[in-house]
Amino acid sequence: APFDDDDKIVGGYNCEENSVPYQVSLNSGYHFCGGSLINEQWVVSAGHCYKSRIQVRLGEHNIEVLEGNEQFINAAKIIRHPQYDRKTLNNDIMLIKLSSRAVINARVSTISLPTAPPATGTKCLISGWGNTASSGADYPDELQCLDAPVLSQAKCEASYPGKITSNMFCVGFLEGGKDSCQGDSGGPVVCNGQLQGVVSWGDGCAQKNKPGVYTKVYNYVKWIKNTIAANS
């Protein structure tokens, strides 16, 4: 295999325990997507992570072991973006209202929404419990982290001709080897302390000239705020 290493996410590393306190796991009997806690009662995830019933798991590190810091809260409302397109994955964003407020502490805390769009070259942190193998499958129990740069929109569009909308951007490495993968969807891309991206899609994982594609959260700040206000 081209990237046959002891990869995490793919090509990342084990996050320090509870070092990504805004990261949540979406569970429907199994972990299927990630998400980000943006206030005590709301989580941002990907539109294609929609399910009718979701349990949000906060304070997780090892998702197969009860470690004592977890908060399991059922979703009260699941609101996919009204213009979500499952064929193109445009507007791939979703809000989840928790049935009760999360208890904010050192291991469970919120992440800020962006105040400006992501700048090319900015180093970001991507995290999740997704597949760690670029071919085949190997799902980790412990949260994985990856540091990766924002790519220019030109490089992003060149990697996926005709598929990149203004609501998407690329993060990663054109040489391959490091990327988010299946199971990471909905999870955070945090740059300079702001939630700039939501893990969305890609052509395989960690393949050369096929970087990860992420929902541009900046474009949805108004929708997020309006939706929260209308459902509080």
Partner: antibody, heavy 126, light 106 residues
Framework: QVQLQESGPGLVKPSETLSLTCTVS????????WSWIRQPAGKGLEWIGR???????NYNPSLKSRVTMSVDTSKNQFSLKLSSVTAADTAVYYC????????????????????WGQGTTVTVSS | DIQMTQSPSSLSASVGDRVTITCQAS??????LNWYQQKPGKAPKLLIY???NLETGVPSRFSGSGSGTDFTFTISSLQPEDIATYYC????????FGGGTKVEIK
């Protein structure tokens, strides 16, 4: 091509534990999710649960208290144990491979079960 | 649990007829819906995944549609080899199957 074969006792006494094994041939058990499904004679299908090759499981909530699944990658096998059986557990038991992660989205998605064993009949009777 | 209600429970049609089976979920399951064919004494066979996608090798006379709570499975031109019981199955939360529809030839 991948083939599945269920094996185990065809007769189990009430209150005992039903144990079945599914052997995967023609391909590796690794990197897949695997399910158990049962079907009482003349009735519909009931999903029992699924296991990933790491050993991670999820079970049908109505059976969860009685079900244990395990996997042995070295033997290319996965197993089902169902405790405290009654006559209601009499059925044809199938093992199957879960089809997962088509397309480009990076969620964990399942798309049905694409490879099945031929099934094994288990009768619970004293 | 999400309940899957299939109808009709049985039907009889002539060779060449268009056959339609419906499946209703007790709550929104998006497109997390698959269809199977089971012939007597055999294991089920996956025909349609994700509500409308034809599994590899399955004849094009089989099709599926729907999203949310209401789904339809269609055989555009019934063939003798299509005699079987057909099941819908959801995978939105855990897995549940519909009760099945037995298809017979008139």
């Amino acid at each position: 091509q991948v083939q599945l074969q269920e094996s185990g006792p065809g007769l189990v006494k009430p209150s005992e534990t039903l144990s079945l094994t599914c052997t995967v041939s023609g391909g590796s058990i690794s990197s897949y999710y695997w399910s158990w499904i049962r079907q009482p004679a003349g009735k519909g299908l009931e999903w029992i649960g699924r296991i990933y090759t790491s050993g991670s499981t999820n079970y049908n909530p109505s059976l969860k208290s009685r079900v244990t699944m395990s996997v042995d990658t070295s033997k290319n096998q996965f197993s089902l144990k169902l405790s405290s059986v009654t006559a209601a557990d009499t059925a044809v038991y199938y093992c199957a491979r879960d089809l997962t992660n088509y397309g480009s989205g990076k969620s964990i998605r399942f798309y049905g079960m694409d490879v099945w064993g031929q099934g094994t009949t288990v009768t619970v009777s004293s | 649990d999400i309940q899957m209600t299939q109808s009709p429970s049985s039907l009889s049609a002539s060779v060449g007829d268009r056959v339609t089976i419906t499946c209703q979920a007790s709550q929104d399951i998006s497109n997390y819906l698959n269809w199977y064919q089971q012939k007597p004494g055999k294991a089920p066979k996956l025909l349609i995944y994700d509500a409308s996608n034809l599994e590899t090798g399955v004849p094009s006379r089989f099709s599926g549609s729907g999203s949310g709570t209401d789904f339809t499975f269609t055989i555009s031109s019934l063939q003798p080899e299509d005699i079987a019981t057909y099941y819908c199955q959801q995978d939105d939360n855990f897995i549940t199957f519909g009760g099945g529809t037995k298809v017979e030839i008139k």
